[in-house]
Amino acid sequence: GWVWNQFFVPEEMNTTSHHIGQLRSDLDNGNNSFQYKLLGAGAGSTFIIDERTGDIYAIQKLDREERSLYILRAQVIDIATGRAVEPESEFVIKVSDINDNEPKFLDEPYEAIVPEMSPEGTLVIQVTASDADDPSSGNNARLLYSLLQGQPYFSVEPTTGVIRISSKMDRELQDEYWVIIQAKDMIGQPGALSGTTSVLIKLSDVNDNKPIFKESLYRLTVSESAPTGTSIGTIMAYDNDIGENAEMDYSIEEDDSQTFDIITNHETQEGIVILKKKVDFEHQNHYGIRAKVKNHHVPEQLMKYHTEASTTFIKIQVEDVDEPPLFLLPYYVFEVFEETPQGSFVGVVSATDPDNRKSPIRYSITRSKVFNINDNGTITTSNSLDREISAWYNLSITATEKYNIEQISSIPLYVQVLNINDHAPEFSQYYETYVCENAGSGQVIQTISAVDRDESIEEHHFYFNLSVEDTNNSSFTIIDNQDNTAVILTNRTGFNLQEEPVFYISILIADNGIPSLTSTNTLTIHVCDCGDSGSTQTCQYQELVLSMGFKTE
């Protein structure tokens, strides 16, 4: 049978030929009658065999990290017969390890983030070195980790490479640290090989700083003409934290929040002072408000850093603006009777300069030839008024500061012209009618009505009468219906067309005004030749009416 021990060859041997061991058959009596052969990958190139003795040699420098074992085949042949003495057999050559590889950190670069103010013992990151040497061969690949840079803030567990915090750190003082870790093989014994890596440790922010106003006093100004919602200035607090932890909210302490407000610009983290209610220089020309600031997000466990909110005082000066005159009333309504003489008093308007210098005021009435106004605001008529032409005047009064004619205010002025009884009633239309020659007494020949251009406080009431002459010449009579109409009736029997073809009746119409006015109105009555049925046969009036296009009924 075959006789051999396990074969080992140390790696990295520099000799041209290194004896590994011997392969031999127990039938070999040492008389050089057997021939040994080596077959397989590496035979002849990496390993050779002494054909006579079976001694095996490595003729190449081997690298265990490249290849740690070779499986070869051995043959032994009887030189005399050429036959195999033993069956072909496989054997293994193992490459034994030497400590020729330093530890390497293969997962570089290392970077970790840990919250600032983390307590001692907090795990930061684990670094791992690899050693290409054989972990089963002594201590060649047994590593120990140590810290070359990073004390006193960090420590490393010697066997695991776990980096932990060993002292609290404040991001606001230093926000990142470079830690250098060394890995040594041979568990750090003499002759050990080492490798190093750098770890960038960044501190993430926690909200351990409250915002603080940079200034204890801000001076701002606002124009009294500024509308509500106007931004009048900004205030700024500073927070040493970053990101969400530096987001802040500004507010005004409750007692001061009537006239002003503060809103927060979350992009710039500024407080914007806003006008909440209009200010008036003449009423109050300065204000003092106290603002406070606090963080938007504060976890419960960090409230200890945020007990007292930072405050600042804001002095706001109101800037005087030359304001236009201010009328006592938003509009004026005056009444004046029609037909009052030119220069009659209508009313008084009044405007004042709201500013402290109290400029005198001048007044004017726009687009009016009917009214005048003087520097005292007294309005008078410049023409006689006729209510029946215009019952209302819609005007505009302008007040101008004497010292600054650009400061103008205007308000509406309404003047109502009151009625006086200056128009007598009249026929509501032109009346012209006819009477038949054969008309009997008491026959109604016309109903009349009247109108009056005056305005009546009560309803108009008209009174109808015949004139004195017509009353005496009693061919016709009138009856007042008491409803502002009257009827004309014949007062005799029979009329003669040839003798008296037309009658002109004067009718007096009086109104119920004080004093009462009366007008005389003429009613024309034509005499016609009528048939038995009452239809007109011959009538100058009819021809007249037909030629003029009047209706006869």
Epitope: A41, R64, E65, R67, S68, I71, R73, L106, S130, A132
Partner: antibody
Framework: QVQLQESGPGLVKPSQTLSLTCTVS??????????WSWIRQHPGKGLEWIGY???????YYNPSLKSRVTISVDTSKNQFSLKLSSVTAADTAVYYC????????????WGQGTLVTVSS | EIVLTQFPGTLSLSPGERATLSCRAS???????LAWYQQKPGQAPRLLIY???SRATGIPDRFSGSGSGTDFTLTISRLEPEDFAVYYC?????????FGGGTKLEIK
Amino acid sequence: QVQLQESGPGLVKPSQTLSLTCTVSGGSISRGGYYWSWIRQHPGKGLEWIGYIFYRGRTYYNPSLKSRVTISVDTSKNQFSLKLSSVTAADTAVYYCARVNSNYGWFDPWGQGTLVTVSS
Amino acid sequence: EIVLTQFPGTLSLSPGERATLSCRASQSVSSSYLAWYQQKPGQAPRLLIYGASSRATGIPDRFSGSGSGTDFTLTISRLEPEDFAVYYCQQYGSSPLTFGGGTKLEIK
């Protein structure tokens, strides 16, 4: 896990040099115990081993191609490369890169392969 | 160089049947140095068996390998539709490293 990806021109002119790169991801090329290999497969044919390299630079080539083949490694980029000079149409093939167990010689994993055509 | 001869060149079987693929070496190869691969069209080869009989990670147990010296066998106990492919053997026992010519396993 380790993955391999071949890259390079799909068309090479005769007599020129074919150049391919294999990028290793999911693991370091610098770990011991493995060779980094190139294999090719002619269209419709079997597999032919070209050669391999250890990350420290030692190379092993198929004697049939040895005069024309160079395999190199760039550990900083986790890549290894193949150069095949003086190509002819007979070098048209799908070229694969693969990791080889250095003790027992099996190929795993493989890249997905890249077809290189040699034509003018 | 060691020449690996695979036979049959083509094997026609139906799903559910047993497949036996052979690989013969021109000279003795250590069983530790023999591997089997599966290749589907348009894909890279995939390691099935290493050391003549050890299944690679993720390979179903219907695949098994055996043999020593010069004769090695890949057996698929019960064919699944996805098993129809080309199979290659490969040796590492002698330089240069070589592959067999392949056996095409096709659906009958």
